[in-house]
Interface confidence: low
């Protein structure tokens, strides 16, 4: 666990977009880059390791969770789990970073269940900002319309019973007030 979050479980999954494009991780010049592209039917999809966390604090963001507690995830390529999917709030890019300390706040995403098939990932450090698809790349998207297709992702090869248990029933609908985003406060420990 880290900074007030407790690890529920971790599980591998492949990540694809609303339009069935695959999210893959390619090593180029010693660094991983993230690709979003069509994968052949017989092609093995890259997998991510998703770590699911439950925060003990009441949600300041409208994440789906258990007993009013928000559910957060962070993600690593299954082939290198010391690298984290990272929401860079300086240039609004989504990138893979290897950190010498535990993953920064930018590596945590509040999980929203959009339907029985789709989820979205809201940046913990940037409420109202989601991982989205722009020009065949992942980017940070400020999305007022939470039903927008480009922030919806499908997680496959994941235990559906677990997903159902922690994020609620498939026909779950966000309440209007739950969908409103509140200002996120940093907590200091001095």
């Amino acid at each position: 666990s880290i900074q007030g979050t407790s690890l529920l479980t971790q599980s591998p999954a492949s990540l694809s977009t609303y339009n069935d494009q695959s999210v893959s991780f390619v090593l180029e010049n010693g660094c991983y880059v993230i690709n979003v592209d069509d994968s052949g039917k017989d092609q093995e999809q890259d997998q991510v390791l998703l770590r699911y966390y439950e925060s003990p604090c009441p949600a300041s963001q409208s994440g789906d969770g258990v007993d009013g507690k928000k559910l957060m995830v962070n993600m690593s390529p299954i082939k290198d789990t010391d690298i984290w999917l990272h929401a860079n709030d300086k240039d609004y890019s989504v990138e893979l970073q290897r950190g010498d300390v535990s993953p920064p706040e930018q590596a945590f995403f509040v999980l929203h269940k959009k339907s029985s098939d789709f989820v979205s990932f809201e940046c913990k450090n940037l409420p109202g900002t989601y991982i989205g698809v722009k020009d065949n790349q992942l980017a940070l998207v400020e999305e007022k319309d939470e039903s927008c297709n480009n922030i919806m992702f499908k997680l496959s090869k994941i235990n559906p019973a677990f997903l159902y248990k922690v994020v609620g029933a498939a026909d779950y609908k966000d309440d209007d007030d739950k969908a409103a985003h509140h200002h996120h406060h940093h907590h200091h420990h001095h």
Epitope: S1, I2, G4, C31, D82, K90, V101, H188
Partner: antibody, heavy 117, light 108 residues
Framework: EVQLLESGGGLVQPGGSLRLSCAAS????????MSWVRQAPGKGLEWVSA????????YYADSVKGRFTISRDNSKNTLYLQMNSLRAEDTAVYYC??????????WGRGTLVTVSS | SYVLTQPPSVSVSPGQTARITCSGD??????AHWYQQKPGQAPALVIY???ERPSGIPERFSGSSSGTTVTLTISGVQAEDEADYYC???????????FGGGTKVTVL
């Protein structure tokens, strides 16, 4: 209140070994990344090593790689730095620090390591 | 290896404004954090994430960022602000932390 108390510093000959300890209190030690940062006399700060709660990952500055080993005992709330093959240039005050997300929010008072014959 | 560059020293009269710069190629993408160190003491955080001020730090301390340079500004400098100041950030890959060389602020 977060407290980090280093110990184990002292005078050692070149090529010798030393083990530093950092006793942590006032927070859930097992939940935080911890590091050692050093400062040679009259010089600037240098990041040395880090230990994360994630899969027990450890990281080292190039200057100490292969000679220093960071470890932690979560049951004792203690961080360690085993220093082998010490050199004169390792002479410094060694600080135990706690990370809060991407920055250091708490520092110990430091322990002096002197490598000299 | 990655380098963060700071001026070695800055001198300022009481009540004036001190500006300390920190330059590094990765700073458009990586946050910088600032630490104050007084003689014989451990460093203490004064600014994090380029511009954020921790609770307990006086309002006269502020941070800004532009391109490859971040700046720590001390407005209305007081005698107690005399100290060494260090910026810290990550290398371009995010793989390790780097400190700047430090800037000694002298209050005249």
């Amino acid at each position: 209140e977060v407290q980090l108390l280093e110990s184990g510093g002292g005078l050692v000959q070149p090529g010798g070994s030393l083990r530093l300890s950092c006793a942590a209190s006032g927070f859930t030690f097992s939940s935080y990344a911890m590091s050692w940062v050093r400062q040679a006399p009259g010089k600037g700060l240098e990041w040395v090593s880090a230990s994360t709660p994630w899969q027990g990952s450890t990281y080292y500055a190039d200057s100490v790689k292969g000679r220093f080993t960071i470890s932690r005992d979560n049951s004792k709330n203690t961080l360690y730095l085993q220093m082998n093959s010490l050199r004169a240039e390792d002479t410094a005050v060694y600080y135990c620090v706690r990370w809060y997300w991407g920055w250091i929010d708490s520092w110990g008072r430091g322990t002096l390591v002197t490598v000299s014959s | 290896s990655y380098v963060l560059t700071q001026p070695p020293s800055v001198s300022v009269s009481p009540g004036q404004t001190a500006r300390i710069t920190c330059s590094g190629d990765a700073l458009p993408k990586q946050y910088a954090h600032w630490y104050q160190q007084k003689p014989g003491q451990a460093p203490a955080l004064v600014i994090y994430k380029d511009t954020e001020r921790p609770s307990g730090i006086p309002e006269r301390f502020s941070g800004s960022s532009s391109g490859t340079t971040v700046t720590l500004t001390i407005s209305g400098v007081q005698a107690e602000d005399e100290a060494d100041y260090y910026c810290m950030s990550s290398d371009p890959s995010g793989a390790s932390r780097v400190f700047g060389g430090g800037t000694k602020v002298t209050v005249l």
